[in-house]
């Protein structure tokens, strides 16, 4: 078993919470069985853990909030993996676990005697996980011993039912709004005919199927609809892309309700099948606007359109953030197996030294260069100040007129902290409202995201439009450069005056063969051509009948 | 159906055009490759133009050879002709309309004699 | 660059014989091989496509197989009408090649 899952980053307080974070990449297919994870993660990783660090202290340092309480974190790797997380949230409840027992004098030596061993303080509620599939998992375990979680970035439509995930919370909004903002871009550009692909687990699966139900009732057809993990191998992604190239070029469309890394996938499989440009992606939110999914495929990505979750960058992160050293930084135990990765260079004399870079890391690289905000960190940020207002509540309620922890709220009740959590209301990072519906909800506000290739070898994603409350505004001109540039994704271009659709057997209603109705017939319904009646003609227009005009012959009339 | 036109004998550095006219199905539908063959020696494959309009080539025909397409025609057009291009060139459509799958309808090939 | 690498280059076999001819891809590529048939002034007719499907109208003593990097065309009960060159073709990308076909493999009827 790897040994990096074991490593845990500590800040002391009289309250702790958990933080789980994919500061590494997932488990590729053959290392799965060891629960080995993968290279280390900025955005989705470090710069979580030291969101969660940095934030913790500013809530410490306000007076207002909390008074006489010093929260406390303990975060641990998910590796955006189920069993890791699980793993690591099973670290979090023998926490607990421990004690209470000790609350109640449980601990007891092997030889029987007392211990002096002071345990660590019980975990009150976690923050993350970032995937949907490893939340439901860690929601799972975490309920049993009710500790409320609250989510970042699972957006699963699942984990809006509270009879199943009672301690599950989250300031994002469930994934029906996103594919509804999708269907309502496809409808727009009316593109009848597009194919889907989803990641297998639960974020994909729950948002695809939502996609293809509200496109079902708007009309639109789904060529075929694949899926496919997001750590798949080389071949599974060809395979996928030549089923895709089989519906060419009638369905240009590929909706994506995919993570980013299984875009990412599907980029690098076009370029090895030469089949950049021949697919527009639409992405949802696990795509949104990240850099780490584009890199060096941005050929491939040019013109895909995706969703994104309302959440301006945190320039007090970044003033914190881009500050940061090894030489200081000993809080976070991944910063130095991070900094030797994000500049490819070995920390000479670190404890963390890794032989594998040839390079020393020199004293003038700073994380200025080429810094990308994470894109959920206001989400991230949201979370944590949700949790410290939700104490904050509790104590205000259960500690009136005292400061700090009184006994009334030793130890913390979890089903306590999740009422006074599901009443809170407070002004977020960005200044928007941060409030949860009966399901633990928050409401959606989504920007559209366009990747165009800005100049000679440069791309960039631009805001091209918004979806707030069921209501979408699209710059098209940004999009289009001109009405004739808009793809086409059709299975049939209609018919011509005087001609019916024809739908052949097993075939999806968007796809017909246009057949002319007989030279007696007019054009009942789009699906029917009627006889006229004995005495009657087609109109010009074929869309009726009208009387043949009674001509009487006379004796001398030439034969017509 | 494919058949190919414009073969022809021409002196070395002398541009050539070849036409593939298409009949029966539509060019937006799928790929058309152009190959050649060398008198005596193996098939060749000079380059695709998917039903989108990209184009890819071999990289030894890169620069050389461009393909561009009408509604009904596929055109080949060849620069800087040695004797080593000497071949009867076919066009073939693919089965898909983008990447390279399989070839499925052939012409029957034009002659291009390049000799001083 | 994606290779093709076919042998042997010519093969002699008898009337009702088995011949064996073998393509080598230089990368994995997955299914995607499809052989082909040349008889002298005749364009190539497609026999078999992903590796092992029989294309319309060919006869079932023509076997495709094989996966990955190693793919071969058998012939059983070989017939005079089936002397003739024979192509392997990588169906897999059409980027950065110098070929998509195999040298060809002269089938000799005796």
């Known amino acids: 078993q790897s040994s990096e899952r074991r490593v845990v980053a500590h800040m002391p307080g009289d309250i702790i919470i958990g933080a789980l974070f994919s500061v590494h990449h997932q488990p590729t297919v053959d290392k799965v069985h060891e629960r080995k994870c993968g290279a280390v993660r900025e955005q989705y990783g470090i710069q979580r853990v030291e969101a969660m660090l940095h934030t913790l202290e500013r809530i410490n340092s306000d007076p207002t909030l909390l008074p006489n309480i010093t929260l406390g974190c303990e975060i641990r790797d998910s590796c955006w993996h189920s069993a890791v997380a699980l793993e690591q949230s099973i670290e979090f409840i023998r926490d607990s676990l421990i004690s209470s027992e000790e609350e109640e004098g449980l601990v007891r030596c092997v030889d029987g005697s007392s211990s002096s061993f002071r345990s660590k303080k019980p975990i009150v509620g976690v923050i993350g996980p970032g995937s949907s599939s490893v939340a439901i998992q860690v929601q799972n375990l975490l309920q049993l011993f009710n500790i409320p979680q609250i989510a970042y970035s699972a957006t699963s439509m699942d984990l809006s039912d509270k009879t199943l995930f009672k301690y599950f919370m989250r300031v994002v909004p469930s994934d029906a709004q996103q594919a509804r903002a999708m269907v309502d871009i496809v409808k727009r550009y009316n593109w009848t005919y597009v194919s889907a692909v989803h990641t297998e687990g639960n974020y994909g699966e729950s948002g695809m199927e939502a996609f293809k139900d509200m496109s079902a009732k708007e009309g639109i057809c789904i060529a075929h609809s694949y899926k496919i993990y997001s750590n798949a191998g080389e071949q599974s992604f060809d395979k996928l892309l030549k089923k895709l190239t089989s519906h060419l070029p009638k369905a240009r469309v590929v909706a994506c309700f995919c993570e980013g890394m299984t875009v990412r996938g599907l980029l690098m499989a076009m370029r090895r099948l030469g089949l950049a440009g021949e697919f527009l992606l639409l992405g949802s939110d696990g795509w949104a606007d990240r850099y780490d999914v584009t890199d060096g495929y941005q050929r491939e990505a040019v013109g895909g359109i995706t969703i994104k979750l309302q959440s301006p960058d945190v320039k007090w992160f970044d003033d914190y953030y881009l500050k940061l050293r090894p030489e200081t930084n000993h809080r976070n135990p991944w910063f130095q197996e991070f900094w030797q990765h994000r500049f490819q260079c070995r920390l000479e004399g670190f404890p963390q030294e890794n032989s594998k870079y040839n390079k020393t890391c020199n004293s003038s690289l700073t994380l200025k260069t080429h810094h990308v905000q994470d894109s959920k960190m206001g989400f991230v940020i949201n979370a944590i100040y949700s949790m410290a207002y939700g104490l904050h509540n509790m104590q205000m309620s259960l500690c009136p007129g005292y400061a700090g922890l009184c006994d009334a709220m030793k130890p913390i009740d979890g089903r306590k902290l999740l009422e006074s959590l599901m009443k809170t209301n407070f002004t977020g990072v960005s200044g928007d409202t941060i409030l949860f519906d009966e399901n633990g909800d928050s409401p959606g506000r989504y920007e559209i995201m366009n990747f165009k290739e800005m100049g000679k070898d440069y791309f960039d994603y631009i805001n091209v439009g918004s979806w707030d409350n069921g209501e979408l505004k699209m710059d098209d001109d940004e999009v289009w450069s001109k009405k004739s540039n808009i793809i086409r994704s059709v299975c049939s271009e209609p018919c011509e005056k005087g001609q019916i659709k024809v739908i052949r057997k097993g075939e999806v209603s968007c796809c017909w063969t246009c057949t002319p109705c007989k030279e007696n017939e007019y054009v009942f319904d789009e699906y029917t051509c009627k006889a006229c009646q004995l005495g009657s003609w087609p109109t010009d227009d074929l869309t009726g009948c009208d009387l043949i005009p009674v001509q009487y012959l006379r004796w001398g009339d030439p034969e017509p | 159906s494919v058949e190919e036109s414009g073969g022809r004998l021409v002196t070395p550095g002398t541009p050539l055009t070849l036409t593939c006219t298409v009949s029966g199905f539509s060019l937006n539908n799928y790929a058309m490759n152009w190959i050649r063959q060398a008198p005596g020696k193996g098939l060749e494959w000079i380059g695709i133009?998917?039903?989108?309009?990209s184009t890819y080539y071999a990289s030894w025909a890169k620069g050389r050879f461009t393909a561009s397409k009408t509604s009904t025609t596929v055109d080949l057009k060849m620069t800087s002709l040695t004797t080593e291009d000497t071949a009867t060139y076919f066009c073939a459509r693919d089965e898909l309309a983008a990447g390279i799958n399989y070839f499925t309808l052939w012409g029957q090939g034009t002659l291009v004699t390049v000799s001083s | 660059a994606l290779v093709m690498t076919q042998t042997p280059a010519s093969v002699e076999v008898a009337v009702g014989g088995t011949v064996t001819i073998k393509c080598q891809a230089s990368?994995?590529?997955?299914?995607?091989c499809s052989w082909y048939q040349q008889k002298l002034g005749q364009p190539p007719k497609l026999l078999i496509y992903?590796?092992?499907k029989l294309a319309s109208g060919v006869p079932s003593r023509f076997k495709g197989s094989g996966s990955g990097t190693q793919f071969t065309l058998t012939i059983s009960g070989v017939e005079c009408a089936d002397a003739a060159t024979y192509y392997c073709?990588?169906?897999?990308?059409?980027?950065?090649?110098?070929?998509?076909f195999g040298g060809g493999t002269e089938v000799v009827v005796k």
């Open positions: 073709q990588q169906g897999y990308s059409p980027s950065g090649v110098d070929n998509v």
């Open positions: 990368q994995n590529i997955i299914d995607w």
């Open positions: 133009i998917y039903g989108s309009g």
């Open positions: 992903e590796a092992s």
